[in-house]
């Protein structure tokens, strides 16, 4: 009757292997670093390195973890219960509304403008007008001033999903 | 690949009912319990209901609990909610999800999802 996920379903490596330690759900859910399996009574514990969970669930597989692409430094390992964090390697940075590369920074602000902030993993440089101190949108300028600057020291890192 | 398709919001008048479905599109929902939130503009999703597919049992915000039912099919894996006796205060764009996410198990109510559908639009006017 139940139309739930078979382990043949999963990829290989997310199959439910004899040697993953088993414990009992609590309330119906299992902890962080565990996936339910199908008839709701075990918690099969997540791959270190492949797969993770991060809150109490009731998942019928861990979630893959992801790889940082080229042109990213793995700041943190995937481990059972976090994911891999990933961030922009220098010089480079990830915007909000396009998470899924990274971008070149700019090296030098138009004329008119000066810098006020550093290229980071997360921003780009940013410039605003000499005199009204109005932000520059961020487009790249037609024109650009000899000032460059160097990337800035991260802060923070940028945790992406997978 | 886990994917949620919600259908069945639309417009309606205080005191009228609307029944949601959800239906995965995948051959799995991913996860044993499914459930349903909501938004309004400039508000975090809010928890409504949610139902475990193996045995039944439900769950429910105190906000809808005697006025919204969850229910599931299997054979056609599909989650359904029957809203009645609807409020304005009940327009907003509904969200199923799967993967339950909480901070202890023994949480009633989920702080999030690992999967989302796409949403429906629910209003209801006085």
């Known amino acids: 009757e139940s139309a739930l996920i078979t382990q043949q379903d999963l990829a290989p490596q997310q199959r439910a292997a004899p040697q993953q330690k088993r414990s009992s759900p609590s309330e119906g859910l299992c902890p962080p670093g565990h996936h339910i399996s199908e008839d709701g009574r075990d918690c099969i514990s997540c791959k270190y390195g492949q797969d993770y969970s991060t809150h109490w669930n009731d998942l019928l597989f861990c979630l893959r973890c992801t790889r940082c692409d080229s042109g990213e430094v793995e700041l943190s390992p995937c481990t059972t219960t976090r994911n891999t964090v990933c961030q922009c390697e220098e010089g480079t940075f990830r915007e909000e509304d396009s998470p899924e590369m990274c971008r070149k920074c700019r090296t030098g602000c138009p004329r008119g403008m000066v810098k006020v902030g550093d290229c980071t993993p997360w921003s780009d440089i940013e410039c605003v007008h000499k005199e009204s101190g109005t932000k520059h949108s961020g487009e790249v300028p037609a024109v650009e001033e000899t000032v460059t600057s160097s990337p800035g020291t991260p802060a923070s890192p940028c945790s992406l999903s997978g | 690949e886990v994917q949620l398709v919600e259908s069945g919001g639309g417009s309606v008048q205080a005191g009228d009912s609307l029944r949601l479905s959800c239906a995965a599109s995948g051959r799995t929902f991913g996860s044993i319990r499914v459930g349903w939130f909501r938004q309004t503009p400039g508000k975090e999703r809010e928890f409504v209901a949610a139902?475990?597919?193996?045995?039944?049992?439900?769950y429910y915000a105190d906000s809808v609990k005697g006025r919204f039912t969850i229910s599931r099919d299997n054979a056609k894996n599909t989650v359904y909610m029957q809203m009645a006796s609807l409020k304005p205060e009940d327009t907003a764009v509904y969200y199923c999800?799967?993967?339950?996410?909480?901070?202890?198990?023994?949480?009633?109510?989920?702080?999030?999802?690992?999967?989302w559908g796409q949403g429906t639009q629910v209003t209801v006017s006085s």
């Open positions: 999800a799967a993967g339950l996410q909480y901070n202890r198990s023994a949480d009633r109510v989920p702080v999030g999802a690992v999967y």
């Open positions: 139902i475990n597919r193996n045995d039944g049992t439900t």
